[in-house]
């Protein structure tokens, strides 16, 4: 099996407005070298949700929980969820370069928002 897998185990997550949503992502290898980024939506209009290296993402925190040697946890938590946050979130592995290039995306997790 060639190179790495990006695993988003949850097809969907439902969260009450005002609560936090945890979006899970594990990656089976650091190779090829490069960062992980989170996006909402796909294609050229997708919205960057979190990038470890740069940017200001006050509602997003990292929630690594994995103690397994066979994978690494790149999950995030988004606080104070509102209906505007609904959508499909993708964990994306990039290959380092100038510029970094997208290497592999997870299958996506659909976030739905329930009324309080």
């Amino acid at each position: 099996e060639e190179e790495l897998q990006v695993i988003q185990p949850d097809k969907s997550v439902s969260v009450a407005a005002g609560e936090s949503a945890i979006l899970h992502c594990t990656v089976t290898s650091l190779i090829p070298v490069g960062p992980i980024q989170w996006f909402r939506g796909a294609g050229p209009a997708r919205e960057l949700i979190y990038n470890q290296k740069e940017g200001h993402f006050p509602r997003v925190t990292t929630v690594s929980e994995s103690t397994k040697r066979e994978n690494m946890d790149f999950s995030i938590s988004i606080s104070n969820i509102t209906p505007a946050d609904a959508g499909t979130y993708y964990c994306v592995k990039f290959r380092k370069g100038s510029p970094d290039t997208e290497f592999k995306s997870g299958a996506g997790t659909e976030l739905s928002v329930r009324a309080k």
């Epitope: 099996e1 060639e2 190179e3 089976t28 290898s29 650091l30 190779i31 090829p32 070298v33 490069g34 960062p35 992980i36 470890q52 990292t62 929630v63 690594s64 994995s66 040697r69 066979e70 994978n71 690494m72 946890d73 790149f74 999950s75 995030i76 290959r95 380092k96």
Partner: antibody, heavy 118, light 112 residues
């Protein structure tokens, strides 16, 4: 049981070449990132090269880039390090190392000694 | 390059006491809460052996008297209580996405 057996070390003159081999057994070689790490009494441990599980991606520090080439043959469970334009500072024990994720160096061979001297 | 400063270079500890080894990286080796710092033990005439991966996770088969802690730039390996078979040289190693991957200079642990 994971086994990594290095071979190909020896004495070579500056400017010369060597090819190190590593025979792997006891694990699914084609699923593992593989590396070489070397050790000298003066410089301690130094990462030398890493190759992805499928062999597509290779990485080297500047100290060996352009001189060393890492390759693998997953059908033969083998890893190879071609070392050209060898220098005295390449003298070291070279370890073959397997890594499930490319993060930590999980299992190490016993090492093979490379001596570069005129 | 990320430079790792490991201290002390050598350490003499009484049997049954605590041994503490530190590694400081010149910049953070964390990503998404994962700390890409690892610890190895090397006994004379043997290759290094993985003890702790990603700062605090004990490798399978390693006694639980070994523990690791820390994040970002500061990391610690603790052996408590120290046993005779723990006499060895210990190395830390960072594998952040910033190449090259680098090692600390090693700490030689002896019995006092």
């Amino acid at each position: 049981e994971v086994q990594l057996v290095e071979s190909g070390g020896g004495l070579v003159k500056p400017g010369g070449s060597l090819r190190l081999s590593c025979a792997a057994s006891g694990f699914t070689f084609s699923s593992y990132v593989m590396s070489w790490v070397r050790q000298t009494p003066g410089k301690g441990l130094e990462w030398v090269a890493t190759i992805s599980s499928g062999g597509t991606y290779t990485y080297y520090p500047n100290s060996v880039k352009g001189r060393f080439t890492l390759s693998r043959d997953n059908a033969k469970n083998s890893l190879y390090l071609q070392m050209n334009s060898l220098r005295a500072e390449d003298t070291a024990v070279y370890y073959c190392v397997s890594s499930m994720t490319g993060s930590s160096f999980d299992y190490w061979g016993q090492g093979t000694t490379v001596t570069v001297s005129s | 390059d990320i430079v790792i400063t490991q201290s002390p270079a050598s350490l003499a500890v009484s049997l049954g006491e605590r041994a503490t080894i530190s590694c400081r990286a010149s910049e953070s080796v964390d990503s998404y809460g994962n700390s890409f710092m690892h610890w190895y033990q090397q006994k004379p005439g043997q290759p290094p052996k993985l003890l702790i991966y990603r700062a605090s996770n004990l490798e399978s088969g390693v006694p639980d008297r070994f523990s690791g802690s820390g994040s970002r730039t500061d990391f610690t390996l603790t052996i408590n209580p120290l046993q005779a078979e723990d006499v060895a040289t210990y190395y830390c190693h960072q594998s952040s996405e910033q190449l090259p991957w680098t090692f600390g200079g090693g700490t030689k642990v002896e019995i006092k």
